[in-house]
């Protein structure tokens, strides 16, 4: 049909800055190259009806849907989403193509569904399908990697049973310590599943998809160095594999080492050597102890022997079951104002812990680090100082973990206070939660000094505003103290602070700031 | 046999260091640890590190830390503890031991000791 | 850091007594225990190591027991070379620690 437009349908997918949720046509992100969607006539239709290749989309991730119709003369368009229409502003880019887009920020599943566009151009008319679609993320997983001899050769294979086929790359390190950080210049990523470079002083395996990333460190004692704080300790669930690489330097190849459980040695087929010369002509040689599948009777001291080198020995631990131990008793702090602190929680976990830190219903992440007495710690620092209950919540494949924190930050009293024609209230944050007197203001006591007991009801059911504590105290009023100004002070060991109030005749209440002492 | 020989008693004033030496023979140097312990008059055994001779790599107490270096020179299989900024408190007999070669931070042979007196 | 506790801190017994030594750790340490002998002046010389073996050339009448916390050293039949200052020191974790010791003297 010679008088049909040329279409053409493309996908931006954007990266989200946490632009605000809507629909619009304006920019308000980083975009990725478009990606064609081959916008085909739909056969058999009534009319002239184009059908975009169909979207899958990520939860909560943003994307614009662009039609680009070379076609002579003004369009006019409506776009149509679940019997909605929508406002459409079609412009002209630089080939002088009319250009219409429909921005969907943050996906949710109510903005998934069939979003159709009527154009009209001085030609003809025509509508565009496009189905959009959320991505079934819940078939998808990330499995922690794990290790493979390659057959016949000295290498390993680095395998993660995850959906969608996740990217595997090798992190190799050379130096001690903190300089093996993620992002530390000593660190090298090989993007491949096989290894042959086996002698590094850390490797590491990590597969990542869009579940995010997961790492497998290789066991390793180094019998040049010290051993760890405490005897290193190994957990595996009944059928993982098992790795254990002894790594010893000598200034000539006369040396061998051995592999011994429970001081016997291990059969053949569970060990195998490699060697090589260093820059320095010293030999390295490393022997690595493997089981495909553990079982329980693979428990025990696993002791790395060498003829030259002191020898070390692992803790293997077989377990049923996935665990996390650490105390779950509450914590309750109480700290200054410009005080340093951070809440941490010391745990041993296997497999490794997802955890987040939670306050206030917000999220925050969470960081692990693990220590050499086998223990590993996650510190939260960023509280900023704000009262409250933090939660910190970890869980691994087969446990979970809840421990709760209370922070109150020791200050002075603030006052605020109100009053209806029967009372008079005040309130005050403040830490520790502070006590009340009343005083009467008269010519008898201009300073006043002349103190109220009757009629005062302190609350001390305190209610959570915010995570802060408040206190109150009310006034009933009575003739004797009616027309008079009265005050309520609150004071606690960091100080006083205190309000004045002119209990006047039924009507607006003026209230005084008094100093804060 | 296994023998670990230290050098001789010191006498030191505060604030001075001392280096203490062990000389080992009748077994492989660089197949065993070797850790060094303190013992003040009438008082307890007092762990102050340990030295893996293969590497030189060390761990020290936390107590000890910044104060004490322990090195080892494996043509002679001798190790080294050297302790400076010294105190009375530091008054003791310090002994070299080797660690034992399977039990994990076991000790199985003791050196004679050496005292250090701190006095000015 | 892992403390160890000794008790009795002394004791008196007499030649061919049965001597029992406990020592206690603030924290499971399994079977990494070591028993150390010392007389006056002398360096300690290693009994019993892993809790309950015991060190070649060591007498017989020398016994370690214990797993986790508990530990004890039993000497079956006192000699008279027996009588000096007995020592535990767990053998898991640095720094390594030492229990006060026990001192078997002469009733």
């Known amino acids: 049909n010679q008088d049909l437009p040329v279409i053409k349908c493309v996908l931006i997918n954007h990266k989200n800055n946490d632009s605000s949720v809507g629909k619009s046509s304006s920019y308000p992100m980083v975009s990725e190259s478009p990606e064609d969607l081959g916008c085909a006539l739909r056969p058999q239709s009534s009319g002239t009806v184009y059908e975009a290749a169909a979207v899958e989309v990520d939860v909560s991730a943003s994307i614009t849907l662009q039609v680009l119709v070379d076609a002579p003369g003004n369009i006019s368009c409506l776009w149509v989403f679940k019997h909605s229409s929508l406002n459409c502003q079609p412009h002209f880019d630089l080939q002088n193509r009319g250009v219409v887009s429909m921005v969907i920020l943050k996906m949710t599943e109510t903005q998934a569904g069939e979003y159709l566009l009527f154009i009209q151009s001085e030609a003809t008319n025509y509508t565009i399908l496009f189905t959009v679609s959320i991505r079934n993320t819940l078939l998808y997983t990330l499995r922690r990697p794990y290790f493979r001899k390659m057959e016949n050769q000295d290498a390993l294979v680095c395998i993660s049973e995850s959906v969608p086929e996740p990217i595997v790359e090798w992190v190799l390190c050379d130096s001690q310590g903190e300089s093996c950080k993620e992002e530390s210049p000593a660190v090298v990523k090989k993007e491949e599943k096989v290894l042959h470079e086996l002698f590094g002083t850390d490797i590491r395996c990590c597969a990542r998809n869009e579940l995010g990333r997961e790492c497998t460190r290789l066991f390793t004692i180094d019998l040049n160095q010290t051993p760890q704080t405490t005897l290193p300790q190994l957990f595996l669930k009944v059928g993982e594999p098992l790795w254990i690489r002894c790594k010893a330097v000598h200034v000539n190849h006369g040396f061998g080492l051995t592999w011994e459980l429970e001081n016997k040695a291990l059969e053949e087929g569970n060990y195998f050597e490699m060697s090589t010369y260093s820059t320095n002509r010293t030999m390295i040689r490393i022997l690595f102890a493997f089981v495909s599948s553990v079982a329980r009777n693979d428990t025990g001291y696993y002791t790395c022997s060498s003829s030259k080198h002191p020898s070390q020995s692992a803790l293997v631990t077989i377990v049923e079951k996935g665990f996390i131990n650490a105390t779950n008793s509450s914590e309750d702090y109480e700290i200054d104002q410009y005080e340093e602190f951070c809440f941490s929680v010391r745990f041993k976990a296997y497999p490794q812990i997802r955890c987040t830190w939670t306050f206030s219903r917000k999220s925050f992440p969470c960081e692990q680090k693990g220590l050499d007495n086998g223990y590993s710690i996650s510190k939260f620092c960023n509280h900023k100082h704000q009262p409250g209950e933090y939660i910190f919540h970890a869980e691994n494949d087969d446990a979970q973990f809840t421990k709760m924190f209370t922070l109150n930050i020791r200050r002075k009293p603030q006052v605020l206070a109100e009053a209806s024609a029967s009372q008079a209230s005040c309130f005050s944050d403040g830490y520790p939660l502070p006590s009340w007197t009343w005083k009467k203001c008269s010519d008898k006591s201009p300073n006043c000094t002349e103190e109220i007991t009757e009629g005062v009801w302190n609350r001390k059911a305190n209610r959570k505003v915010f995570g802060q504590w408040v206190s109150s105290s009310t006034l009933n009023m009575s003739e004797a103290i009616k027309g008079f100004l009265v005050k309520c002070c609150a004071y606690n060991s960091l100080g006083t602070s205190c309000e004045t109030i002119l209990l006047n005749s039924p009507g607006p209440f003026p209230f005084i700031q008094d100093n804060i002492s | 046999q296994v023998q670990l020989v230290q050098s001789g008693a010191e006498v030191k004033k505060p604030g001075a260091s001392v280096k203490v030496s062990c000389k080992a023979s009748?077994?492989?140097?660089?197949?065993?640890?070797m850790h060094w312990v303190r013992q003040a008059p009438g008082q307890g055994l007092e762990w102050m590190g340990i030295?893996?001779?293969?590497?030189?790599?060390?761990r020290y107490a936390q107590k000890f830390q910044g104060r004490v270096t322990m090195t080892r020179d494996t043509s002679t299989s001798t190790v080294y503890m050297e302790l400076s900024s010294l105190r009375s408190e530091d008054t003791a007999v310090y002994y070299c031991?080797?660690?034992?070669?399977?039990?994990?931070?076991?000790?199985?042979?003791w050196g004679k000791g050496t005292t250090v007196t701190v006095s000015s | 850091d892992i403390q160890m506790t000794q008790s009795p801190s002394s004791l008196s017994a007499s030649v061919g007594d049965r001597v029992t030594i406990t020592c206690r750790a603030s924290?499971?340490?399994?079977?990494?225990l070591a028993w150390y002998q010392q007389k006056p002046g002398k360096a300690p010389k290693l009994l019993i190591y892993?809790?309950?073996s015991l060190q070649s050339g060591v007498p017989s009448r020398f016994s370690g027991s214990g797993s986790g916390t508990d530990f004890t050293l039993t000497i079956s039949s006192l000699q008279p070379e027996d009588f000096a200052t007995y020592y535990c020191?767990?053998?898991?974790?640095?720094?390594?620690?030492f229990g006060g010791g026990t001192k078997v003297e002469i009733k």
């Open positions: 020191q767990q053998a898991i974790s640095f720094p390594l620690t």
């Open positions: 009748g077994y492989s140097f660089t197949t065993h640890y």
């Open positions: 892993a809790a309950s």
């Open positions: 030295i893996n001779p293969s590497g030189g790599s060390t």
């Open positions: 031991a080797r660690g034992s070669s399977y039990y994990y931070y076991g000790v199985d042979v």
């Open positions: 924290q499971s340490i399994s079977t990494w």
